[in-house]
Interface confidence: medium
């Protein structure tokens, strides 16, 4: 019968012959007399075999990732009467792994969205890295991950490429953050292979600020010849929010004279003084509001941000209309 | 800190002119609005004259309207009272005062300048 | 315009004691728009009190104001001897005008 152990090459050999191993029949007495052949893809061009001795040898530079094992088949003849001395049998040459490829992201481009100010512990995206080396040849394909840029405010799980959010972040100082994952391979042992991946993060805006009068004090002025429902002016708060959570309402929160209101204009976010009584120069020439903003909405959880409202002071000076030149402060 | 300093003060015949001012310092004098207030001697205070921040408008006593003009210069930091017609009961320390950003009291005074009319 | 009439228009007292002064407003001061000052001689007035009841920078706290409407008070509650002095009450709500000034003396 046929006498082989299994057969193992080493992918990426760079000698120009590698010694496979040697298949023989255990009626060959090492008198020459018998004749090996190798047949099948592969045979002659990426094998050959010694036709005397049976040694098979790689003659090629092998790749495990484009061919992982060959299946060839053997021959045996005695030359003396030309006839199979064994009968024709098949056999597998395999293709051992080396750590030859680098981690692979596959995804790529990365990019999530966290709400800012999201906790600690807060999940954002998993990352994957692909081996394209043996999972089941040691710790060639065997993955760890880690942060190359992005503390402190996240970490990477190193065996699942979860990023988690480990410091609290805030949109109105930066609201992008670019993290780069590393992937080893080789458990990150000496000899690691490795890949990067950028990962856009985008925070979310959740109102956690509350809006604040551009000014402490604004002065207008208004004729006593002004109607009521007249426009005299406007005051204007900001808020470092955005979209929704930058609405806001504009309020009177004290005028004992019960004569001007204030409106909000929702396009512009202004708040707009309204005469509501007549005024009379020589009755009172000047008035002082204290007016109000908050913001529109407002959820419950983020109501500690938004106690005590911003005010702002409104002088408002009297015109009168009978005597031009007696303006007043 | 704040510092007003009134100058100007003197002298004058019935029907003559005089023109008071008061250097401020120590504050920004383009955000305040600032009056005249003047004390005859021996008697109380009696508020002059006040012009706007911005210097648009302007707002007298009867006592003096048509006859005093309040102005400022930002430039110089100096406010202005230029007086006009004088008469003998104009006679006072005049006082410079700026009014307090969020109500219309006076929280600073000069040392104030003395106007004598008399002939 | 809003005249207004202060009491006494002396008040005899000793260092120590408490000072009581009025300031009666012809209509009424709208927003408590009154405010006290003090004239010590050969100097400028000094404001002590606004808006009727709130203590100026640097104040010291035996000054206190109250009232609302017509009826104001300025309440010394121990004097000091720099306490003696002139003190004016004005009003702001309507133009500006002040009281004829209550002279506290040392007795």
């Known amino acids: 019968g046929w006498v082989w152990n299994q057969f193992f090459v080493p992918e990426e050999m760079n000698t120009t012959s590698h010694h496979v191993g040697r298949l023989r029949s255990d009626l060959d007495n090492g008198n020459n007399s018998f004749q090996y052949k190798l047949l099948g893809a592969g045979a002659g061009s990426t094998f050959i075999i010694d036709e005397r001795t049976g040694d098979i040898y790689a003659i090629e530079k092998l790749d495990r990732e484009e061919r992982s094992l060959y299946i060839l088949r053997a021959q045996v003849i005695d030359i003396t009467t030309g006839r199979a001395v064994e009968p024709e049998s098949e056999f597998v040459i395999k293709v051992s792994d080396i750590n030859d490829n680098e981690p692979k992201f596959l995804d790529e481009p990365y990019e999530a969205i966290v709400p800012e100010m999201s906790p600690e512990g807060t999940l954002v995206i998993q990352v994957t890295a692909s081996d394209a080396d043996d999972p089941s040849s040691g710790n060639n394909a065997r993955l760890l991950y880690s942060l190359l840029q992005g503390q402190p405010y996240f970490s990477v799980e190193p065996t699942t490429g979860v990023i988690r959010i480990s410091s609290k972040m805030d949109r109105e100082l930066q609201d992008e953050y670019w993290v780069i994952i590393q992937a080893k391979d080789m458990i990150g042992q000496p000899g690691a292979l490795s890949g990067t991946t950028s990962v856009l993060i985008k925070l979310s805006d959740v109102n956690d600020n509350k809006p604040i009068f551009k000014e402490s004090l604004y002065r207008l002025t208004v004729s006593e010849s002004a109607p009521t429902g007249t426009s005299i002016g406007t005051i204007m708060a900001y808020d470092n929010d955005i979209g929704e959570n930058a609405e806001m309402d504009y309020s009177i929160e004290e005028d004992d004279s019960q004569t001007f209101d204030i409106i909000t204009n929702h396009e512009t976010q202004e708040g707009i003084v309204i005469l509501k009584k007549k005024v009379n120069f020589e009755h009172q020439n000047h008035y002082g509001i204290r007016a109000k903003v908050k913001n529109h909405h407002v959820d419950e959880q983020l109501m500690k941000y938004h106690t005590e409202a911003s005010t702002t002071f409104i002088k408002i000076q009297v015109e009168d209309v009978d005597e031009p030149g007696g303006g007043g402060s | 800190q704040v510092q007003l300093v009134e100058s100007g003060g003197g002298v004058v015949q019935p029907g003559g002119s005089l023109r008071l001012s008061c250097a401020a310092s120590?504050?920004?004098?383009?955000?305040?609005?600032m009056h005249w207030v003047r004390q005859a001697p021996g008697k109380g205070l009696e508020w002059v004259a006040v012009?706007?921040?911005?210097?648009?408008?302007?707002y007298y006593a009867e006592s003096v309207k048509g006859r005093f003009t309040i102005s400022r210069d930002t430039s110089k930091n100096t406010l202005y009272l230029q007086m006009n017609s004088l008469r003998a009961e104009d006679t006072a320390v005049y006082y410079c005062?700026?009014?307090?950003?969020?109500?219309?009291?006076?929280?600073?005074w000069g040392q104030g300048t003395l106007v004598s009319v008399s002939s | 315009e809003i005249v207004l009439t202060q009491s006494p228009g002396t008040l005899s007292l000793s260092p120590g004691e408490r000072a009581t002064l009025s300031c009666r407003a012809s209509?009424?001061?709208?927003?408590?728009?009154l405010a006290w000052y003090q004239q010590r001689p050969g100097q400028a007035p000094r404001l002590l009190i606004y808006?009727?009841?709130s203590r100026a920078t640097g104040i010291p706290d035996r000054f206190s104001g109250s009232g609302s409407g017509t009826d104001f008070t300025l309440t010394i509650s121990s004097l000091e001897p720099e306490d003696f002095a002139v003190y004016y009450c004005?009003?702001?709500?309507?133009?500006?005008?002040f009281g004829q000034g209550t002279k506290v003396e040392i007795k």
């Open positions: 005062a700026r009014e307090r950003y969020f109500d219309w009291s006076f929280d600073y």
């Open positions: 120590g504050f920004t004098f383009s955000s305040y609005d």
């Open positions: 012009i706007s921040y911005e210097g648009t408008n302007e």
């Open positions: 209509q009424s001061v709208s927003n408590t728009y």
């Open positions: 808006g009727a009841s």
């Open positions: 004005q009003q702001y709500s309507n133009s500006w005008t």
